[in-house]
């Protein structure tokens, strides 16, 4: 007998063909011999089956000797052997209906697990293979689990169910809730305004939750909460903010924080957490602030950086358009008795300048000018 696979909630069309290319009497029955539907002349008639309101046919095909049975909004329990009786013949079709669902919400936090559960009719022994949006294949039986979801797992998962050499494909849209970047570094000269941005890697109709930015200044022994805020339908409202520094926060997404001035005592790293309504766990983004200061005191020109810098970063002092006078993988460099002129303090990574501060050194009878 013919085997047809269907998907829960879908529509399936089972075919039945007579040798005569004309409209003749036909009936569709289930394995219990209960009539589902048939015809009386050119009219569709329905029997007392459980499918009554979900069964249909295509009258336009009857003239060609085709008598399909359409079953709408398929249920797992519709899995059965269906018998088409036409011209004293019986055609049997075995219908197997499968369902594949994510056992939790399809919006999951980064790092959480995804479990896909296959609903199948009794007596079936299907195999399932799923392909993630980044091309990773996972195989299983009734359940498939993926632990530690990553941002690249967001998108359409395509799962193929195999049974009796037939296959049916399911598509499940998964949204991994995360910030676009796990970590970011902001490099600023002392006194400059600092902008921190925390763009989300997903879009949802309504976004509600609460968040907080904890800051560990390099100079401080412990971390402190700089700001707490609420998020309601993508609108941001500040709940509490420290007096020093007095952060400002944008009212709309993406989450945006402004620090009026970059000062050495603020250099360090922060962790922004966002707890979303109806979700267990939190979204995290690390943010780092590196501050540079160039100063001249008496005969000493000094350049310093504060904050989380990598050991491979180079700090240099050079007179404009000249070779670097001093260049070290350290957080402070200095030049004694600097020549007059415009000096540049550069923080660079493999030749790429990350931060630059200029200081004008006047002849020794003058005081220095910081542009």
């Amino acid at each position: 007998k013919k085997v047809v696979l269907g998907k829960k909630g879908d529509t399936v069309e089972l075919t039945c063909t007579a040798s005569q290319k004309k409209s003749i009497q036909f009936h569709w029955k289930n394995s219990n011999q209960i009539k589902i539907l048939g015809n009386q002349g050119s009219f569709l008639t329905k029997g007392p089956s459980k499918l009554n309101d979900r069964a249909d046919s295509r009258r336009s095909l009857w003239d060609q000797g085709n008598f399909p049975l359409i079953i709408k909004n398929l249920k797992i329990e519709d899995s059965d052997t269906y018998i088409c009786e036409v011209e004293d013949q019986k055609e049997e079709v075995q219908l197997l209906v499968f369902g594949l669902t994510a056992n939790s919400d399809t919006h999951l936090l980064q790092g959480q697990s995804l479990t896909l559960t296959l609903e199948s009719p009794p007596g079936s022994s299907p195999s399932v293979q799923c392909r993630s949006p980044r091309g990773k294949n996972i195989q299983g039986g009734k359940t498939l689990s993926v632990s530690q979801l990553e941002l690249q797992d967001s998108g359409t998962w395509t799962c193929t169910v195999l049974q009796n050499q037939k296959k049916v494909e399911f598509k499940i849209d998964i949204v991994v809730l995360a910030f676009q970047k796990a970590s970011s570094i902001v490099y600023k000269k002392e006194g400059e305004q600092v902008e921190f941005s925390f763009p989300l890697a997903f879009t949802v109709e309504k976004l509600t939750g609460s968040g907080e930015l904890w800051w560990q200044a390099e100079r401080a022994s412990s971390s402190k909460s700089w700001i707490t805020f609420d998020l309601k339908n993508k609108e941001v409202s500040v709940k509490r903010v420290t007096q020093d520094p007095k952060l400002q926060m944008g009212k709309k997404l993406p989450l945006h924080l402004t620090l009026p001035q970059a000062l050495p005592q603020y250099a360090g790293s922060g962790n922004l957490t966002l707890a979303l309504e109806a979700k267990t766990g939190k979204l995290h983004q690390e943010v780092n602030l590196v501050v540079m200061r160039a100063t001249q005191l008496q005969k000493n020109l000094t350049c310093e950086v504060w904050g989380p810098t990598s050991p491979k970063l180079m700090l240099s002092l050079k007179l404009e358009n000249k070779e670097a006078k001093v260049s070290k993988r350290e957080k402070a460099v200095w030049v004694l008795n600097p020549e007059a002129g415009m000096w540049q303090c550069l923080l660079s990574d493999s030749g790429q300048v990350l931060l630059e501060s200029n200081i004008k050194v006047l002849p020794t009878w003058s005081t220095p000018v910081q542009p």
């Epitope: 879908d10 529509t11 069309e13 075919t15 569709l44 336009s60």
Partner: antibody, heavy 121, light 107 residues
């Protein structure tokens, strides 16, 4: 929500062929037929035929038999209608329409936005 | 092929009017008939199926009746958005055929 998105307008010379696509989203590719209906400028609607996107079966109106071919690509949920040996009277807007079956009868429930095919020398 | 003939071909009416469009089939189509509305530059929209069943989302001012060969579409109280062209279509047998259309214009 079902959406049918058709390919863009085409200008063809008499005798040439045209292939119009119709991509279905928001619904699975089974349990319905996709019909093609055309409308000449300022004229009424004319049914051309259907394709079963799942099984691939087709039925064409006698008028277009031999000139029309309907195909489908299940991997992209797209159906195609190709009309060959074009003549000026084939200038029309071509629509794909997804049917709904009710008590044995098909009706055109969802329509694509239409594709204008102009046949001109 | 079954011929479908609509009348009138065009008609002018005012907002609030009651309007009736008729459709005649060249042979019996039972109640297997649909009505569609089409606005300029847009695709047709299913209003009525099985001669008198209102498609979901269609305002109740639209109604259909008839069986066999004679059918009517009635708009009980015309609204500004109802000015369009209306088509009947038989779904009894292949090839499916449409009426030539009735253009409903503002008086």
């Amino acid at each position: 929500q079902v959406q049918l998105v058709q390919s863009g307008a085409e200008v063809k010379k008499p005798g040439a062929s045209v292939k119009v696509s119709c991509k279905a989203s928001g619904s699975t590719f089974s349990g319905y037929y996709m019909h093609w209906v055309r409308q000449a400028p300022g004229q009424g609607l004319e049914w051309m035929g259907w394709i079963d996107p799942n099984g691939g079966g087709t039925q064409y109106a006698q008028k277009f038999q031999g000139r029309v071919t309907m195909t489908r690509d299940t991997s992209t949920s797209t159906v195609y209608m190709e009309l060959s040996s074009l003549r000026s009277e084939d200038t029309a807007v071509y629509y794909c329409a997804k049917d709904i079956v009710h008590d044995g009868t098909e009706y055109f429930q969802h329509w694509g936005q239409g594709t204008l095919v102009t046949v001109s020398s | 092929d079954i011929q479908m003939t609509q009348s009138p071909s065009s008609l002018s009416a005012s907002v609030g009017d009651r309007v009736t469009i008729t459709c005649r089939a060249s042979q019996n189509v039972n109640t297997w008939l649909a009505w569609y509305q089409q606005k300029p530059g847009k695709a047709p929209k299913l209003l009525i199926y099985e001669a008198s069943s209102l498609q979901s989302g269609v305002p109740s001012r639209f109604s259909g009746s008839g069986s066999g060969t004679d059918f009517t579409l009635t708009i009980s109280s015309l609204q500004p958005e109802d000015f369009a062209t209306y088509y009947c279509q038989q779904a009894n047998s292949f090839p499916f055929t449409f009426g030539q259309g009735t253009k409903l214009e503002i008086k």
